[in-house]
Amino acid sequence: QGGTRSPRCDCAGDFHKKIGLFCCRGCPAGHYLKAPCTEPCGNSTCLVCPQDTFLAWENHHNSECARCQACDEQASQVALENCSAVADTRCGCKPGWFVECQVSQCVSSSPFYCQPCLDCGALHRHTRLLCSRRDTDCGTCLPGFYEHGDGCVSCPTSTLGSCPERCAAVCGWRQMF
């Protein structure tokens, strides 16, 4: 009382930091700093982040919250998790689509667009790896189909059908005639 020296930050508990004259307790995640504390080891005045904004960490200095990102509809992105006061929107791809990074060194914050997954069934192939972080990995031709060029061709259903060597190996009994 009545002194003139500002105290050092030797407050009980953690998360106190000098803000101007005094050591203040910071604001919890999801809150911004309205006004710093007005006495040693005091609580700052903190307010909840308004709608469509967030702060993910405890902080001493943010006087405004960060704006939530909007998922890029042009890139076919969707919100996997909506923005909250403590976390930004998590954008991703809807089921049946995969993330295609727009930069070579891809990290979680890199820009991306969504691509439709390959439908192995439509290509008459086995699904070797399901599509999630990368495109579907299709395997060999389904039963009743054989490799021909880049695709799978249906085994001939009549004796009139031509059946090259690979067809004969896969289609079996069909190549008796």
Epitope: Q1, G2, G3, T4, R5, S6, G20, L21, F22, K34, A35, P36, C37, T38, E39, P40, G42, T45
Partner: antibody, heavy 116, light 107 residues
Framework: EVQLVESGGGSVQPGGSLRLSCAAS????????MSWVRQAPGKGLEWISY????????YYADSVKGQFTISRDNAKNSLYLQMNSLRAEDTAVYYC?????????WGQGTLVTVSS | DIVMTQSPSSLSASVGDRVTITCQAS??????LSWYQQKPGKAPKLLIN???NLETGVPSRFSGSGSGTDFTFTISSLQPEDIATYYC?????????FGQGTRLEIK
């Protein structure tokens, strides 16, 4: 709109007393630390006292310690400065100012003249 | 107490000039420094806090820089309405102290 309005200034003889008031409006007064700053005629600014938002902590410049008392009434949104044993060198315009260090709003000031 | 030394104490400049005022603290005050403008007969007005943060509504021609003990206040292009006295102020420690002021006038 934030407003700070000082009152209570005037002329007083050396050794006399005055009580300055500062009426605050347009913000949550009880959330802010407040200070008194004075300015002698033709001179610079001198911080003289600070009070925390709750009124629990007060600080004074050495030049007024034991002579001036800062106080506040959050229910009335008011800040006060009780000035005793006034001397000629206390003649100044007295400003109330909002903030815990950096003063973002100031009143228009009230003139205190100490003269026989 | 922390002594704030402002220079120059007065200066004369022309409209459009770049004006620089310096402020030196007698000890390290980090970035806990404000700049104020005071026009005759008026209360001071906060222009910059935390050494370089421009207050809302303050024209962008005003700027501040520095940390530790040496600080600079700049008006990039002097306007007639900038005629005033400018003060630096530290709030790293009590007692809060001001520089002695810099009186700015038009040539």
């Amino acid at each position: 709109e934030v407003q700070l309005v000082e009152s209570g200034g005037g002329s007083v003889q050396p050794g006399g007393s005055l009580r300055l008031s500062c009426a605050a409006s347009g913000f949550t007064f009880s959330s802010y630390g407040m200070s008194w700053v004075r300015q002698a005629p033709g001179k610079g600014l001198e911080w003289i006292s600070y009070i925390s938002s709750s009124g629990g902590h007060t600080y004074y410049a050495d030049s007024v310690k034991g002579q001036f008392t800062i106080s506040r009434d959050n229910a009335k949104n008011s800040l006060y400065l009780q000035m005793n044993s006034l001397r000629a060198e206390d003649t100044a315009v007295y400003y109330c100012a909002r903030g815990s260090g950096s003063f973002d709003y100031w009143g228009q000031g009230t003139l205190v003249t100490v003269s026989s | 107490d922390i002594v704030m030394t402002q220079s120059p104490s007065s200066l004369s400049a022309s409209v459009g000039d770049r004006v620089t005022i310096t402020c030196q603290a007698s000890q390290d005050i980090s970035n806990y420094l404000s700049w104020y403008q005071q026009k005759p007969g008026k209360a001071p007005k906060l222009l910059i806090n935390d050494a370089s943060n421009l207050e809302t509504g303050v024209p962008s021609r005003f700027s501040g820089s520095g940390s530790g003990t040496d600080f600079t206040f700049t008006i990039s292009s002097l306007q007639p309405e900038d005629i005033a006295t400018y003060y630096c102020q530290q709030y790293d420690n009590l007692p809060i102290t001001f520089g002695q002021g810099t009186r700015l006038e038009i040539k």
